[in-house]
């Protein structure tokens, strides 16, 4: 079976690499525009230049193209803690990232949020914080892990999953209460 190609891919595949088929005349292959530029006018004929113009400030194209407009530069999301790593140029979109000692949590493919790396207080670092993953902590005795923080077993309710980890402490508390009744 031949994979189904979109009209644009079908048209482009007729021309050699780096060229595209003229939208009004399928016997003409025009040279694509370089990155940092966009298509202002198709080439008038074979062997003639495509009219490409540089992207205006606030827009870019990152690869050779025959786009009628440049793409708008992304803005880093301050409300998500993002900072600008590098500014947008005519041939490269803005690069956003996180500050030092922070990691990215991806809510979706194109939305990440910056959070502080856990310090593992009352525990030890099992895996160091990485660009896309928080520190993995192992808690000291008498503490259990809740939302990647080591919390005292005195905060462990019987209904929570911490009961297994905090079982000796819970038994001790129960025993102390029981021994008070004679």
């Amino acid at each position: 079976l031949v994979p189904h190609l979109g009209d644009r891919e079908k048209r482009d595949s007729v021309c050699p690499q780096g060229k595209y088929i003229h939208p009004q005349n399928n016997s003409i292959c025009c040279t694509k525009c370089h990155k940092g530029t966009y298509l202002y006018n198709d080439c008038p004929g074979p062997g003639q230049d495509t009219d490409c113009r540089e992207c205006e400030s606030g827009s870019f194209t990152a690869s050779e193209n025959h786009l009628r407009h440049c793409l708008s530069c992304s803005k880093c999301r301050k409300e998500m803690g993002q900072v600008e790593i590098s500014s947008c140029t005519v041939d490269r979109d803005t690069v956003c990232g996180c500050r030092k000692n922070q990691y990215r949590h991806y809510w979706s493919e194109n939305l990440f949020q910056c959070f502080n790396c856990s310090l593992c207080l009352n525990g030890t670092v099992h895996l160091s914080c990485q660009e896309k993953q928080n520190t993995v902590c192992t808690c000291h005795a008498g503490f259990f892990l809740r939302e990647n923080e080591c919390v005292s077993c005195s905060n462990c309710k019987k209904s929570l999953e911490c009961t297994k980890l905090c079982l000796p402490q819970i038994e001790n508390v129960k025993g102390t209460e029981d021994s008070g009744t004679t």
Partner: nanobody, 116 residues
Framework: EVQLLESGGGLVQPGGSLRLSCAAS????????MHWVRQAPGKGLEWVSG????????YYADSVKGRFTISRDNSKNTLYLQMNSLRAEDTAVYYC?????????WGQGTLVTVSS
Amino acid sequence: EVQLLESGGGLVQPGGSLRLSCAASGFTFGDEPMHWVRQAPGKGLEWVSGIGKEGQPTYYADSVKGRFTISRDNSKNTLYLQMNSLRAEDTAVYYCAKLGGPFDYWGQGTLVTVSS
């Protein structure tokens, strides 16, 4: 058409509680992470909390951690924010938001005023 409708705001005394709700329609609610974002008078937007598609993970801004709880009911297409131990600095318009697709979608907001 995506619609987000917040409710539950109002005037509350410091130390009091409120529960905000957000009714969602026009998209598959259970397929999307959801967020609460607020804007205090004369200030910029501040992300408050977010929740994953199935109710996990949940994240909170440091300023509300331990006081606010985000939850969702996918069968009712509703997002919630339980706010306890409210402080004057929590006074803001609270927006329910679907973020991160080709477009962001916001509700019209609900005003929370914390004052004695």
